[in-house]
Amino acid sequence: EDELQVIQPEKSVSVAAGESATLRCAMTSLIPVGPIMWFRGAGAGRELIYNQKEGHFPRVTTVSELTKRNNLDFSISISNITPADAGTYYCVKFRKGSPDDVEFKSGAGTELSVRAKPS
């Protein structure tokens, strides 16, 4: 009941090409300490979309202020969506480790589909 859960409430999201897609994710606890990452796809070939800890992700903005104390909302918005962005996006909690952080728990995934830009 009290162990951290990763909540991705939408199982699917549909966005028109050129628009922004909001992918919602929240944690139910601040513990364990460690970063959040977003991936497209699962398994070894998954693509990193956003890393809370480091990196440059020009198309991604966070919906809430992640540095805010006690923040549990890790939703992201991806701008200028194209058909190449279609796929299943996973919000993943990592536990702080040494030397590397360890994956702790993943959300259920949100399928992003891209509609043709309205003419």
């Epitope: 009941e1 009290d2 859960q5 990763v6 909540i7 991705q8 409430p9 199982k11 699917s12 919602r24 929240a26 139910t28 699962a42 549990l72 909302d73 299943t88 959300g107 259920a108 995934g109 399928e111």
Partner: antibody, heavy 122, light 111 residues
Amino acid sequence: QVQLVQSGAEVKKPGSSVKVSCKASGGTFSSYAISWVRQAPGQGLEWMGGIIPIFGTANYAQKFQGRVTITADESTSTAYMELSSLRSEDTAVYYCARDGSAGRQEHGMDVWGQGTTVTVSS
Amino acid sequence: DIVMTQSPLSLPVTPGEPASISCRSSQSLLHSNGYNYLDWYLQKPGQSPQLLIYLGSNRASGVPDRFSGSGSGTDFTLKISRVEAEDVGVYYCMQARGLPTFGGGTKVEIK
């Protein structure tokens, strides 16, 4: 053990509004969805909408869009469902249910309130 | 909206005999994460509904093992291996792949 306790029966006039409460006890409130489901006399179950308190925003079935408002107060672990512009067809038992399917794939609607009877009559 | 269709509407059963209820969805309930977002509920007379099966085939806590769920995509089945008198009531399937919708219900009664 999580329990959901709903407010008591209501009798309302057509055109008025009703607000039903659902108080959770014994477990995490903010991280589960609370869904509202209604059942008209002799009819089946109908999902009206739901809210995940941790996000604060609600989703509604198209049929009830614009007429129903679902809110949650994390400080009191209580969810509310307000239905406006009542008509006789809204006479039903209204249930709240803890709904894990909105985020935690381990559960469906695994805890239900006892139901609140709303009668709409002139 | 995803439309859920249940059959039969009514199911007279004999205690000790098996029973089966079918549920069909207008769209696939299979997510790319491998889960089928289909639940089964039982509403006993005068009671609130109770969860029997979630994600197509997982028995909820405290549900007897005579209940089982199967199926994938658009076709699902709830089976009761040996019906008991306490199993009477209305059974509903519900999809949670999109905004939730219920099937019309199947009334199970003792012959």
